[in-house]
């Protein structure tokens, strides 16, 4: 049903990384425009992206209010130039999104190795604690602030001269590993939320190797 020449949106998909959250859908509009609404399970609908010809809508500002809530969105279709027109049921055509719980589902962004420091046969590798768009008390929270003990990092490291990788894990943003004296090592890290069933791991960070600017070497 619906107004002539108006088609309902379909393939509604949440795209979310570190809580930056965009709803995408199809089709590209032809003689129609869209408005998006978002709600928590128990809340009121809030309209966003009014009468847009885009096929995406940034809902970050809404979901960061409580990333542990479960959200539902819907996309309304209106005839271009006649947005008051409604479908045969007395309201515009719309399609619902899947439910989305940011805390459980947002993708983990690619982490960055902030620094590494060698002291003798130990290397301390520090992962950058990336800022999210989630706020508390007017300050932006870091990924660690939001995920706390649920977030771990896995370090992959190997001698520059070989391909055999070792791994280490940390519940903080720092690793302290043993290395062989006189050898250069390369490092890559991955963010992991072990308790998840989906989107458990980030992509690997860019590789950083000893002997490059990012690190510091101290022989003791």
């Amino acid at each position: 049903s619906g107004t002539t020449n108006t088609v309902a949106a379909y393939n509604l998909t949440w795209k979310s990384t570190n809580f930056k959250t965009i709803l995408e859908w199809e089709p590209k509009p032809v003689n129609q425009v869209y408005t998006v609404q978002i709600s928590t399970k128990s809340g009121d609908w809030k309209s966003k992206c009014f009468y847009t010809t885009d096929t995406e809508c940034d809902l970050t500002d809404e979901i960061v209010k409580d990333v542990k809530q479960t959200y539902l969105a819907r996309v309304f279709s209106y005839p271009a130039g006649n947005v008051e027109s409604t479908g045969s049921a007395g309201e515009p055509l719309y399609e619902n999104s899947p439910e989305f719980t940011p805390y459980l589902e947002t993708n983990l962004g690619q982490p960055t190795i902030q620094s590494f420091e060698q002291v003798g046969t130990k290397v301390n590798v520090t992962v950058e604690d990336e800022r999210t768009l989630v706020r508390r008390n007017n300050t932006f929270l870091s990924l660690r602030d939001v995920f706390g003990k649920d977030l771990i990092y896995t370090l992959y490291y190997w001698k520059s001269s070989s391909s055999g990788k070792k791994t280490a894990k940390t519940n903080t943003n720092e690793f302290l590993i043993d290395v062989d004296k006189g050898e250069n090592y390369c490092f890559s890290v991955q963010a992991v939320i072990p308790s998840r069933t989906v989107n458990r791991k980030s992509t690997d960070s860019p590789v950083e190797c000893m002997g490059q600017e990012k690190g510091e070497f101290r022989e003791i």
Epitope: K68, T70, V146, G148, N171
Partner: antibody
Framework: EVQLQQSGAELMKPGASVKISCKAT????????IEWVKQRPGHGLEWIGE????????KYNEKFKGKATFTADTSSNTAYMQLSSLTSEDSAVYYC??????????????WGQGTLVTVSS | QAVVTQESALTTSPGETVTLTCRSS?????????ANWVQEKPDHLFTGLIG???NRGPGVPARFSGSLIGDKAALTITGAQTEDEAVYFC?????????FGGGTKLTVL
Amino acid sequence: EVQLQQSGAELMKPGASVKISCKATGYTFSSYWIEWVKQRPGHGLEWIGEILPGSASTKYNEKFKGKATFTADTSSNTAYMQLSSLTSEDSAVYYCARDYYYGSSYGFAYWGQGTLVTVSS
Amino acid sequence: QAVVTQESALTTSPGETVTLTCRSSTGAVTTSNYANWVQEKPDHLFTGLIGGTNNRGPGVPARFSGSLIGDKAALTITGAQTEDEAVYFCALWYSNHWVFGGGTKLTVL
């Protein structure tokens, strides 16, 4: 308002199993860890383990592996703990608790009223 | 398993400031231990006071504050009141499990 309502007291025979429930209201059940805690007179508080209802992920205190089993029903917003092969050592008050809002504050923010389990022949 | 140690009992007077501490057998307590403080009043009434070292729980009065003092976690009650008489438990997170302290019985005379 966040509330955790636990099931009533149980009198059990040694060797039996008991299942305690913890009904959550006032928040998104799937996104918060539910903690289970044991209290015995003279023994203080012992952490049994935790479950994240949205993923059914669990962690157990080594001491309670094989003794306690956690489940959660997201349709009824209820967490369960089953205790098996009961002995007198299992006689205690058992609590469920919910963690805080964000990660830097994980732990034991809201508590149920407790369920007394008595094991006696 | 780590052992978490608290003062067994402390006494204070109304209006005074009192600090309860929580020591870990594995070394210094850090923010990665997500120190929690829980209050138990008679009839098994538990209330979360502090989570994550220094974050006050919902509805908890401002006189309760959490911090790290030296190598220990601390709960400070600034201007204790008679209704603060209770048992206070701390709990520390160790990578994949929580450990509770034995509790501090606080008397407010």
